[in-house]
Interface confidence: low
Amino acid sequence: ASVIYVYVQDYRSPFIASVSDQHGVVYITENKNKTVVIPCLGSISNLNVSLCARYPEKRFVPDGNRISWDSKKGFTIPSYMISYAGMVFCEAKINDESYQSIMYIVVVVGYRIYDVVLSPSHGIELSVGEKLVLNCTARTELNVGIDFNWEYPSSKHQHKKLVNRDLKTQSGSEMKKFLSTLTIDGVTRSDQGLYTCAASSGLMTKKNSTFVRVHEKPFVAFGSGMESLVEATVGERVRIPAKYLGYPPPEIKWYKNGIPLESNHTIKAGHVLTIMEVSERDTGNYTVILTNPISKEKQSHVVSLVVYVP
């Protein structure tokens, strides 16, 4: 659409009165790189116009660079220069007479997003039918509105639920928090993949991603590299890791010659079987049994420990 300006030069009313009421609103950010235009248009094109901001009272004059006035556009100024002000107006001097535009109320809007955090952030594993809950938290400066956008493998999912809300932050704080929660009630194999949450404030977008792994059903198995024979010399520390694949993580139990091993100051029987100072009597067959906590499926593996006396 083209705009035609017809100048009716009126030295008693150099600023074009807005059809709206007695004041306007200008929205600004404190971004150092942004300028704002105060739309005090002129009926005379070659006026000497300054911008008055209050409170405290400050006057800005065109500097031929980032501060300028154009009768068809208004007064342009870096927004951070008037971010302190409650109101601004344009002023023209004609024959020692001062003429003022309408008042413009200054409303500072934020834009900075400090970070976007996904929770859980990594290592998400589920089996088919389980519920996936992902929280995306954006921390921003004050006076920011946030739009969340999620990208994930089956974005058309019928069972997904998205809830966005503002989190309460301390009154003395320099930041706001926004939370978006993605819930998929019963995941399928097609829900496996990369989940990305993007938060946008209009001027800035930040995003974060995490990988979700979906298993057909709970399972447990020994991983490759699980040793069958371990050799050691008296006095050494022996570590026998239980290398497994499984979801959810299995319960691990160690046995020696069929007798359950309990952890004490000389032996630690957990994800890794550790014998602090191995002795001749530690020689024997060690069995590790992995139990899936959901399906109760069990897998066992025998490791022979041979201890040499130097």
């Epitope: 404190e30 971010s83 302190y84 500072v108 006076n143 301390q170 009154s171 003395g172 320099e174």
Partner: antibody
Framework: QVNLRESGGGLVKPGGSLRLSCAAS????????MNWVRQAPGKGLEWVAS????????FYTDSVKGRFTISRDNSRSSLFLQMNSLRAEDTAIYYC??????????WGQGTMVTVSS | DIQMTQSPSSLSASVGDRVTITCKAS??????LNWYQQKPGEAPKLLIY???ILETGVPSRFSGSGSGTDFTFTISSLQPEDIATYYC?????????FGGGTKLEIK
């Protein structure tokens, strides 16, 4: 070394004015909310005013609204408190304090303001 | 306004004693509560923020707990240098308010 140093206190008559200053050093002043807190002789702490990093938000306690003005100059790492129409009950040590997201973590040593005829 | 009621207003204890101060908020302030120590003639010093987090460099004998409206500040083993007035402060809402203070003395 993070430091806040107040100045500008003194003796003033009721109805008079004073301007307190707080000079900051050792940290990025323009990134923090700044606060004024006062303590009347023998009394507890009372929050007076806060100003956010870019001066976009300013808050006052009810008893000083319309009389006190908090401001800052980030280019000079300075915080100010313009106090007008002073009353006897404004007599106190005035502290400036840095506001982190959670607390007032750095305090100045304070400047004494006495309002008396 | 959120009122902060601190008790006791003063207390006397012996070196090595466990000392407890309580602070009650007139409204739910989640965990936006801080504890400060002020020694005579000095500025206040932050000890604990967010109800229970120890400020860097503060001895571990100081601790804080609580959420909502009821909060507790504890010195596990009182030392002579702990003689001071202690204040709680809420940062949940404007106006920011402090408790009336607890003056701690050595028996």
């Amino acid at each position: 070394q993070v430091n806040l140093r107040e100045s500008g206190g003194g003796l003033v008559k009721p109805g008079g004015s004073l301007r307190l200053s707080c000079a900051a050093s050792g940290f990025t002043f323009g990134s923090y909310t700044m606060n004024w807190v006062r303590q009347a002789p023998g009394k507890g702490l009372e929050w007076v005013a806060s100003i956010t990093s870019g001066s976009s938000y300013i808050f006052y306690t009810d008893s000083v609204k319309g009389r006190f003005t908090i401001s800052r100059d980030n280019s000079r790492s300075s915080l100010f408190l313009q106090m007008n129409s002073l009353r006897a009950e404004d007599t106190a040590i005035y502290y400036c304090a840095r506001g982190s997201a959670s607390a007032f973590d750095i305090w100045g040593q304070g400047t004494m303001v006495t309002v008396s005829s | 306004d959120i009122q902060m009621t601190q008790s006791p207003s003063s207390l006397s204890a012996s070196v090595g004693d466990r000392v407890t101060i309580t602070c009650k908020a007139s409204d739910d302030i989640i965990n936006y509560l801080n504890w400060y120590q002020q020694k005579p003639g000095e500025a206040p010093k932050l000890l604990i923020y967010d109800a229970s987090i120890l400020e860097t460099g503060v001895p571990s004998r100081f601790s804080g707990s609580g959420s909502g409206t009821d909060f507790t500040f504890t010195i596990s083993s009182l030392q002579p240098e702990d003689i001071a007035t202690y204040y709680c402060q809420q940062l949940d809402d404007i106006p920011i308010t402090f408790g009336g203070g607890t003056k701690l003395e050595i028996k």
